[in-house]
């Protein structure tokens, strides 16, 4: 009887990666393309329909468009190999390969997709009133993760974690965790994104810096005061110039010089 086999019935792949799932079928001598039929489906979605030596892309489900292909060269090695690129979380499920070549048979293959919380972005800010530090870690992944905060001496600290849906893909989770703590410069803290499953932890290291930039609320005060101080400086400079030289030309030179130097200071202030 015509029988197809699978070397693996479970494939685990990372979000955004590529996967090639294989079903093997018997080929004696050379493959007769016109006698071969290959179907790949996932639940009710048609992915590949290969008949008379060609794929019919008209029947392919739109979610697999430009991402799924049958590796035709592999057919001559007795393999119906489905390659999926840029794997999405929605691709997870049970796939079925059906091959007709004289006889017919089918096999099921499970695809699991995971997304590690690998790119952890971090931020450290300080409250100017209480001098308390706020440490923040944020990352996207799947499935849900809890965030564990620890200090360099391995103390577990209690942070606050919020989970929302990602803007990138609906099934992806956006996990943000904050830790408020009194800390000193060069002290080290760790945020660990812990998912269910073995070896699924991702950790970021946060080092308290020597000096921290002024929080946004403080910068607002400077933005309000800035123009006033600038104006005051210009008035004082003009008065000084007029008193010292008593000539309009000197006033213009002095003001220009002062205004330019002020501009440079503003730029430097904005950059820091």
């Amino acid at each position: 009887a015509f029988t197809i086999t699978v070397s693996k019935d479970l494939y685990v792949v990372e979000y955004g990666g590529n996967v090639t799932m294989e079903c093997k079928f018997p080929v004696e001598k050379q493959l007769n393309l016109f006698a071969l039929i290959v179907y790949w489906e996932m639940e009710d979605k048609k992915i590949i329909q290969f008949v008379n030596g060609k794929e019919d892309l008209k029947v392919q489900h739109s979610s697999y468009s430009q991402r799924a292909q049958l590796l035709k060269d592999q057919l001559f090695l007795g393999k119906a190999a489905l390659q999926i690129t840029d794997v999405r979380l929605q691709d997870a499920g049970v796939y079925c390969c059906l091959i007709g070549y004289g006889g017919a048979d089918y096999k099921r293959i499970t695809l699991k997709v995971h997304a590690p919380y690998r790119n952890i972005s971090q931020r450290i800010s300080v409250d100017p009133v209480t001098s308390e530090h706020e440490l923040m870690c944020q990352a996207e992944g799947y499935p849900e993760a809890e965030v564990i905060w620890t200090s360099s001496d391995h103390r577990v600290l209690s942070g606050k974690t919020t989970i929302t849906n990602s803007n990138r893909e609906e099934k992806l989770f956006n996990v943000t965790s904050t830790l408020n703590i009194n800390a000193t410069a060069n002290e080290i803290f760790y945020c660990t994104f812990q998912r269910s499953g073995p070896e699924e932890n991702n950790t970021a290291e946060l080092v308290i810096p020597e000096r921290l930039p002024v929080p946004a609320s403080e910068r607002t005060h400077f933005m309000i005061l800035g123009p006033f101080l600038l104006l005051l400086g210009v008035v004082l400079a003009v008065t000084f110039c007029l008193k010292k030289h008593g000539r309009m030309m000197d006033v213009e030179k002095c003001c220009t010089r002062d205004r330019n130097s002020k501009k440079r200071n503003d730029i430097q202030f904005e950059e820091t």
């Epitope: 393309l33 008379n52 030596g53 060609k54 060269d73 001559f76």
Partner: antibody, heavy 117, light 112 residues
Framework: QVQLQQSGPELVKPGASVKISCKAS????????MNWVKQRPGQGLEWIGW????????YYNERFMGKATLTVDKSSNTAYMLFSSLTSEDSAVYFC??????????WGQGTTLTVSS | DIVMTQAAFSNPVTLGTSASISCRSS???????????LSWFLQKPGQSPQLLIY???NLASGVPDRFSSSGSGTDFTLRISRVEAEDVGIYYC?????????FGGGTKLEIK
């Protein structure tokens, strides 16, 4: 740009073997099929077979099975065709031709094989 | 194997006028996916063949739009709207539906 550079002309004795090469450049060698085509003097084109460098998979026209053997060297982006048990009928120009699954688009300049005692 | 048939010679044409070259296949090259797997190649004297048309009606890169192709599943025609001196050579049709790939015998374009 895509280029297929074939080896020079060959003059060989009947019963001998010959290996013709086709060096590819300007594209990813392992992503396309390399076809071989025979053209006898003053005659049409005859497809010998192809090899897919990525996997080494081959397909031969039944008429050339046992006569032609297709191989590749991925490290040098070169495809080879070994022709064995040569007779005067094998005297021809042999072309390599790059293709995807459906379309052959770039040809080598051809290698002239003369079988004569 | 799919057999491709062509006339050895075309009707002689005058430069600047149109020319037609025919090709027939022993089985339909129209696939259920709606694509017809026929290619046209031109081999100029002393040169390698070059691709003109693929999938029956698609013009290959760099080929002037004077060339066009049409047909049913088994009968095909290559048209050259304004023949130029550089168009002389042998025109081959080829099927890429089945394996082995097969070529027609070639049609020589003759100029009056």
């Amino acid at each position: 740009q895509v280029q297929l550079q074939q080896s020079g002309p060959e003059l060989v004795k009947p019963g001998a073997s010959v290996k013709i090469s086709c060096k590819a450049s300007g594209y990813t060698f392992t992503d396309y099929y390399m076809n071989w085509v025979k053209q006898r003097p003053g005659q049409g084109l005859e497809w010998i077979g192809w090899i897919f460098p990525g996997s080494g998979a081959t397909y031969y026209n039944e008429r050339f099975m046992g006569k032609a053997t297709l191989t590749v060297d991925k490290s040098s982006n070169t495809a080879y065709m070994l022709f064995s048990s040569l007779t005067s009928e094998d005297s021809a120009v042999y072309f390599c031709l790059r293709s995807d699954w459906d379309v052959g688009d770039f040809w080598g300049q051809g290698t002239t094989l003369t079988v004569s005692s | 194997d799919i057999v491709m048939t062509q006339a050895a010679f075309s009707n002689p044409v005058t430069l600047g006028t149109s020319a037609s070259i025919s090709c027939r296949s022993s089985r339909s090259l129209l696939h259920t996916n709606g694509i017809t797997y026929l290619s046209w190649f031109l081999q100029k004297p002393g040169q390698s063949p070059q691709l003109l048309i693929y999938q029956m009606s698609n013009l290959a890169s760099g080929v002037p739009d004077r060339f066009s192709s049409s047909g049913s599943g088994t009968d095909f025609t290559l048209r050259i709207s304004r023949v130029e001196a550089e168009d002389v050579g042998i025109y081959y049709c080829a099927q890429t539906l089945g394996l082995p790939r097969t070529f027609g015998g070639g049609t020589k374009l003759e100029i009056k």
